[in-house]
């Protein structure tokens, strides 16, 4: 899977979308997990409703919410009041029994609030040692696409 980058502003909300084939993943609950290290496990943050039929209901765990459009095939995660410590690598997952299939790998970046003049030294960006060569950036800040930029994130 390629990694898709979503950028949000500290203190604001960030919405992450994970498209999927609704027929392929029919009846399957979804989850949002945080990758612990490059090869480490993915720690569950929040999952959709226990009853798949009710997956459209938003479920919260702390400041993170998840909702699933099972017909349209879009999983949406909302990170409310984004903080520097929220930055990192995540996954959208489709659950099947004890299995979890990766729908999308997501890199969350937290940008400094331009109205906040405090030291931005604790804001996290991927270091040079971390490889996200194929990453595609999706800004939560509205802007027009640059020439030649892909309008829709690549999926594999």
């Amino acid at each position: 899977h390629n990694t898709t980058v979503f950028q949000g502003v500290a203190g604001q909300s960030l919405q992450v979308s994970c498209p999927y084939d609704s027929m392929k993943h029919w009846g399957r609950r979804k989850a949002w997990c945080r990758q612990l290290g490059e090869k480490g496990p993915c720690q569950r943050v929040v999952s959709t409703h226990n009853l798949w039929l009710l997956s459209f209901l938003r479920r919260w765990n702390g400041s993170t919410a998840i909702t699933d459009d099972t017909l349209g095939g879009t999983l949406t995660i909302t990170l409310r009041n984004l903080q520097p410590h929220d930055a990192g690598l995540y996954q959208c997952q489709s659950l099947h029994g004890s299995e979890a299939d990766t729908l999308r790998k997501v890199l969350v970046e937290v940008l400094a609030d331009p109205l906040d003049h405090r030291d931005a030294g604790d804001l996290w960006f991927p270091g040079e040692s971390e490889s996200f060569e194929d990453a595609h950036v999706e800004h939560s800040i509205s802007r027009s696409l640059l020439e030649g930029e892909i309008p829709f994130p690549p999926t594999s």
Partner: antibody, heavy 126, light 107 residues
Framework: EVQLQQSGAELVKPGASVKISCKAS????????MSWVKQRPGKGLEWIGQ????????KYNGKFEGKATLTADKSSSTAYMQLSSLTSEDSAVYFC???????????????????WGQGTLVTVSA | DIQMTQSPASLSVSVGETVTITCRTS??????LAWYQQKQGKSPQLLVY???NLADGVPSRFSASGSATQFSLKINSLQSADFGSYYC?????????FGGGTKLEMN
Amino acid sequence: EVQLQQSGAELVKPGASVKISCKASGYAFSNYWMSWVKQRPGKGLEWIGQIYPGDGDTKYNGKFEGKATLTADKSSSTAYMQLSSLTSEDSAVYFCSREKGADYYGSTYSAWFSYWGQGTLVTVSA
Amino acid sequence: DIQMTQSPASLSVSVGETVTITCRTSENVYSNLAWYQQKQGKSPQLLVYAATNLADGVPSRFSASGSATQFSLKINSLQSADFGSYYCHHFWGTPYTFGGGTKLEMN
């Protein structure tokens, strides 16, 4: 009406390979997981693996990794299973079966097998 | 992998009798279990899905119950059409597995 039509019986030599087919009709072939099941003479059912024709994604029973290769051709709505390095242990009837999938709008997985092919007998003999 | 233990392996019964087949799974599969009937030389046919629901066209003399790790299939007033083999099957994640089967033979 959903139908799964499998290819005819095969007599193959030990060490050879065989490719059997399952032609689907009566539904959107790309949108449903297709499984393959093995049944040795007088024995029970064994799940080999499954393929999602929409994108070619496959899942295998570890026991059949390297033995079975699942493919699908969307243009002809046909699923295939190739069995390699055949031995007498591979002599069996092989069924293709389609999951219920999105025909069921309930609160559980819909991965039971609602539709089955008629079976293909593979005999491995010198 | 989830193991499935089906019992009895075979049963010699007469028309009109009541039969119960059980299936035990090594892990909780919730209600993600199906039952199939197979006649000699034929493909399996779906009898029960999601642990307790009868498939279309299945006679009401069949009933199924259970959840988690213990499941059963009951046939009341056995008919001649009911002889054959029965298999349970879990679909709680891959690899899917089947029970070893129960063969119903005429006494």
